[in-house]
Amino acid sequence: FKVATPYSLYVCPEGQNVTLTCRLLGPVDKGHDVTFYKTWYRSSRGEVQTCSERRPIRNLTFQDLALAHGGAQAANTSHDLAQRHGLESASDAAGNFSITMRNLTLLDSGLYCCLVVEIRAAASEHRVHGAMELQVQTGKDAPSNCVVYPSSSQDSENITAA
């Protein structure tokens, strides 16, 4: 399986909300002994590998933001901890998973990574990740809503707040 990032760049005004999205692409094994662990974290475009280093998002670690469930199930974090930080991660049965960040500040700018681990009991872990950039802007040059740039082309889309 692979992870697709529909958008590689999100440019948002300060104070806006944004939902960063990743999509799990098949074939996805939904067997009894397969579990999926999904999470989010901040990182950097390192010399060795992008998304290798795992930094917190608003002081929440990737452990705090984790989702774990069988291949056919949906999951949602309703952690008070995450919501107190203006964050919510969610996943649906179609393979989409996301993190919503509320009331963006300039400090939220940076590289964000989604991580999916396919766990096969008594075998191994298969991990894949996706990366996307968030730029939070302020002042007269800031867009009125988030503008997202698709990973596959240079065309941009204007999206309303999450």
Partner: antibody
Framework: QVQLQESGPGLVKPSETLSLTCTVS????????WSWIRQPPGKGLEWIGY???????NYNPSLKSRVTISVDTSKSQFSLKLSSVTAADTAVYYC???????????WGQGTMVIVSS | EIVLTQSPATLSLSPGERATLSCRAS??????LAWYQQKPGQAPRLLIY???NRATGIPARFSGSGSGTDFTLTISSLEPEDFAVYYC?????????FGGGTKVEIK
């Protein structure tokens, strides 16, 4: 702050079953592997096995025929049973949180189990 | 089962010196390797994950490098509290295995 605490008898007779429990406090038992690792006196670390919060398990083949790990999410506990023990099973037994695609990031303080008649 | 071989078994150094610890895998583990520190009577403590990333709260004097089969843990300048046993651990497949450990002792 997640903390782990092992509990169980410190002395077990040969051929009997070693039983230990690990209590998870300060956080959720969901979304992680919960592992048992042991360390014989003066020796290195050996992974025994894990249970996922959903109940799926994975054991070290060297111990698989004798090991059972179970979880009670309502009590935030997971347990180890090791049957037919011998003196070679004398060790400090640790429970640990194991994050998928990461590492053992939180450990209990360990409990010494001696197998002797 | 992947076998991890650590060398040297014992490293005798003075505070302020540089420590270089090696871990070699019997087959490639990509960069899926962690390092732990263990002091007498204590549980191991995670230092490095994915070969070269420091865990939360670990001082910058600890660094990891390598990929494939050969890995190194470096302590740039030993502090008194760094004298301990260090273990590497792979997680590319199961069973998860640890190296035999390297003891860093005061010279």
């Amino acid at each position: 702050q997640v903390q782990l605490q092992e509990s169980g008898p410190g002395l077990v007779k040969p051929s009997e079953t070693l039983s230990l429990t690990c209590t998870v406090s300060g956080g959720s038992i969901s979304s992680y592997y919960w592992s048992w690792i042991r360390q014989p006196p003066g020796k290195g670390l050996e992974w025994i096995g894990y249970i996922y919060y959903s109940g799926s398990t994975n054991y070290n083949p060297s111990l698989k025929s004798r090991v059972t790990i179970s979880v009670d999410t309502s009590k935030s506990q997971f347990s180890l049973k090791l049957s037919s023990v011998t003196a070679a099973d004398t060790a400090v037994y640790y429970c640990a949180r194991d994050i998928p695609a990461f590492a053992f990031d939180i450990w209990g303080q360990g409990t010494m189990v001696i197998v002797s008649s | 089962e992947i076998v991890l071989t650590q060398s040297p078994a014992t490293l005798s150094l003075s505070p302020g010196e540089r420590a270089t610890l090696s871990c070699r895998a019997s087959q490639s583990v990509s960069y899926y390797l962690a390092w732990y520190q263990q002091k007498p009577g204590q549980a191991p403590r995670l230092l490095i994950y994915d070969a070269f990333n420091r865990a939360t709260g670990i001082p910058a004097r600890f660094s990891g490098s390598g990929s494939g089969t050969d890995f190194t843990l470096t302590i740039s300048s030993l502090e008194p509290e760094d004298f301990a046993v260090y273990y590497c651990q792979q997680r590319i497949n199961w069973p998860l295995t640890f190296g035999g450990g390297t003891k860093v002792e005061i010279k």
